[in-house]
Interface confidence: low
Amino acid sequence: TLNSVLNSNAIKNLPPPLGGAAGHPGSAVSAAPGILYPGGNKYQTIDNYQPYPCAEDEECGTDEYCASPTRGGDAGVQICLACRKRRKRCMRHAMCCPGNYCKNGICVSSDQNHFRGEIEETITESFGNDHSTLDGYSRRTTLSSKMYHTKGQEGSVCLRSSDCASGLCCARHFWSKICKPVLKEGQVCTKHRRKGSHGLEIFQRCYCGEGLSCRIQKDHHQASNSSRLHTCQRH
């Protein structure tokens, strides 16, 4: 668990691939929009420290969130990063340490009671890698019981599939996560070659529906196995 507050550049000096692109020269505008970066967090420099790869926040510890370690996201790998303390910049709730949430791009205390006027019932919600996203930055949702008890419809922001209505799953869309339809027979699916690789997808697909599995399309012939199309097929 990343729980020490130390050198902010430590993560940038990791060996490739995790830190490979951290210091690359480049334009301030990256081709891939706004992947999250560690921001104000400081990282522990321990010889045997191994960054934990992840695809979503739930795979990390309670004091961590899942993001690309580089500002531009060029390294293409997400790891668990230390949560951000109060008053630090954030783009979604999960970035803030326990007891805090993301409001207007800043981690504020959950019991902070200075909301006024029209902002009183709004919160900045987590978008994958935003203010809420990679596109990820701030999503505000009216704070009401509906937010917690109504299952998300297609396109609704979500944190996990249980937030979504039946027939939908929670999948990344840019760097936010929204409810998308579970795949049906014949629909193109993504076969992950290694654990965690789904963290690299900007447009993440849902899994195949019940009784279906993601397999190479039998009549799809390509020179390379890696480029063959996968579809949801009956077991």
């Epitope: 207007n104 930055y137 936010s176």
Partner: antibody, heavy 116, light 108 residues
């Protein structure tokens, strides 16, 4: 490629109105709070206004409150600044920007000159 | 409303270290971001969250923030660093973005 392109600037007389536009591309505009920031000749950067990602909340700097209105059309990926009752001191280059740290991008600006 | 105070100008010889300060009431409790602005160009973020740096910004740029003062430090200053520098915070009590008045860095 993320792009913010401002337009609508020009020369206008005091007391008149002008509407600036900012066309966004290369990112999902509807998910970001957006800002207008201005730079008057020989002066520093001055924040003008913010609009939340969905248009639900808007906040303005004191010098423009009641005269300027920030708005957005997420279906057109466009941010607007309606400027009424313009004054000489509103003369500046106006930038639209995300100001979101990890996603800190600015347009190149559009010049507004208020002069009789 | 929250006010950020910067010195109007700082001069430094090439190869030396420039320090630009940004004063504000208990600014150490806020996240401070620094922008570099060159004539005719849009501002560029050089330091965010007090002391972190976008990957495309040279390591010569660093920041610190505590008490009532935030500082942008530019080591081994080059001619190309000549520009206006602004500190910026989000004032959550007013929901306003606040910029400092700016500091002109002159490389002698």
């Amino acid at each position: 490629q993320v792009q913010l392109v401002e337009s609508g600037g020009g020369v206008v007389q005091p007391g008149r109105s002008l509407r600036l536009s900012c066309a966004a591309s290369g990112f999902t505009f509807s998910r970001y709070d957006m800002h207008w920031v201005r730079k008057a000749p020989g002066k520093g950067l001055e924040w003008v206004a913010i609009i939340f990602y969905d248009g639900s909340n808007k906040y303005y700097a004191d010098p423009v409150k009641g005269r300027f209105t920030i708005s957005r059309d997420n279906s057109k990926n466009t941010l607007y600044l309606q400027m009424n009752s313009l004054r000489a001191e509103d003369t500046a280059v106006y930038y639209c920007a995300t100001l979101a740290a990890a996603f800190d991008y600015w347009g190149q600006g559009t010049l507004v000159t208020v002069s009789s | 409303s929250y006010v950020l105070t910067q010195p109007p100008s700082v001069s430094v010889a090439p190869g030396q270290t420039a320090r630009i300060t940004c004063g504000g009431n208990n600014i150490g409790s806020k996240s401070v971001h620094w922008y570099q602005e060159k004539p005719g160009q849009a501002p560029v973020l050089v330091v965010y969250d007090d002391s972190d740096r976008p990957s495309e910004i040279p390591e010569r740029f660093s920041g610190s923030n505590s008490g009532n003062t935030a500082t942008l430090t530019i080591s081994r200053v080059e001619a190309g660093d000549e520009a206006d520098y602004y500190c910026q915070v989000w004032d959550s009590s007013s929901d306003h973005v606040v910029f400092g008045g700016g500091t002109r860095l002159t490389v002698l």
